[in-house]
Interface confidence: medium
């Protein structure tokens, strides 16, 4: 999906008002310095691409993020403010519903959510030069 035509300011508002709090809750009890940010993004569409990938694509050691509240709210934000996004997600969502997994918070998941926090922070500061 090409995130170029999303309403970035509305997505930013949704992140600041609710998604960010859910990410913090998920990471509660973890030191902010515990994980190094290894995933980066260069502009807002690229950030959303990386955010979508880390949030919804199962990875080795962390298959359960898609059912977390921050993930559901992220999906809602993308569906509302990215034209045509929800149509691209229908098949993926139906497949996910068929194979619901028990939610398990692993260290790998914590690391992944830490990366997500970094991507969201970068998304909110689009004028910053990439380090």
């Amino acid at each position: 999906y090409d995130f170029t035509n999303c309403d970035f300011e509305k997505i930013k508002a949704a992140y600041l008002s609710t998604i960010s709090k859910d990410l913090i809750t998920y990471m509660s009890g973890t030191k902010s310095t515990e994980f190094n940010n290894t995933v980066s993004c260069s502009n807002r569409p690229h950030c959303l691409t990386e955010i979508q990938s880390l949030t919804f694509n199962p990875t080795a050691g962390c298959a359960s993020l898609a059912k977390e509240m921050f993930a559901m709210k992220t999906k809602a934000a993308l569906a509302i403010w990215c034209p045509g996004y929800s149509e691209t997600q229908i098949n993926a969502t139906q497949a996910m519903k068929k194979r619901r997994k028990r939610k398990v918070t692993t260290n790998k998941c914590l690391e992944q959510v830490s990366q997500l926090q970094g991507l969201w922070r970068r998304f909110n500061r689009p004028l910053l030069k990439q380090q």
């Epitope: 709090k21 509240m69 559901m72 809602a76 569906a79 229908i90 969502t93 519903k97």
Partner: nanobody, 114 residues
């Protein structure tokens, strides 16, 4: 197939109140989101407010402090209490259930005019 039915719209004077209802029926699977959108003539549909399954809410800046969203999960119904209505709130109001596959109701017209 999921059906959504909105009700509660009507004509109200500026400063007045309305309460909209959105009833969902059919095969509802783990609803995590219900939202209210509106579309004024000649404008794009915009999100007014949303409520998530953890009880957290989202409001557009233009309605903060005036509108309140709530949901009764046992009835699969969402509500939008609209107070201190303004002429610029005039629009057709729609509800949406979840957003993986957006399902829209027919909408209910809210007209704010003296």
């Amino acid at each position: 197939e999921v059906q959504l039915v909105e009700s509660g719209g009507g004509l109200v004077q500026p400063g007045g109140s309305l309460r909209l209802s959105c009833a969902a029926s059919g095969r509802i699977f783990s609803t995590y989101f219900m939202g209210w959108f509106r579309q004024a003539p000649g404008k794009e549909r915009e999100l007014v407010s949303a409520i998530f399954s953890d009880g957290s809410t989202y409001y557009a800046d233009s309605v903060k402090g005036r509108f309140t969203i709530s949901a009764d999960n046992s009835k699969n119904t969402a509500y939008l209490q609209m107070n201190s209505l303004k002429p610029e709130d005039t629009a057709v109001y729609y509800c949406a259930l979840d957003l993986s596959t957006v399902r829209w109701g027919q909408g209910t017209l809210v007209t704010v005019s003296s």
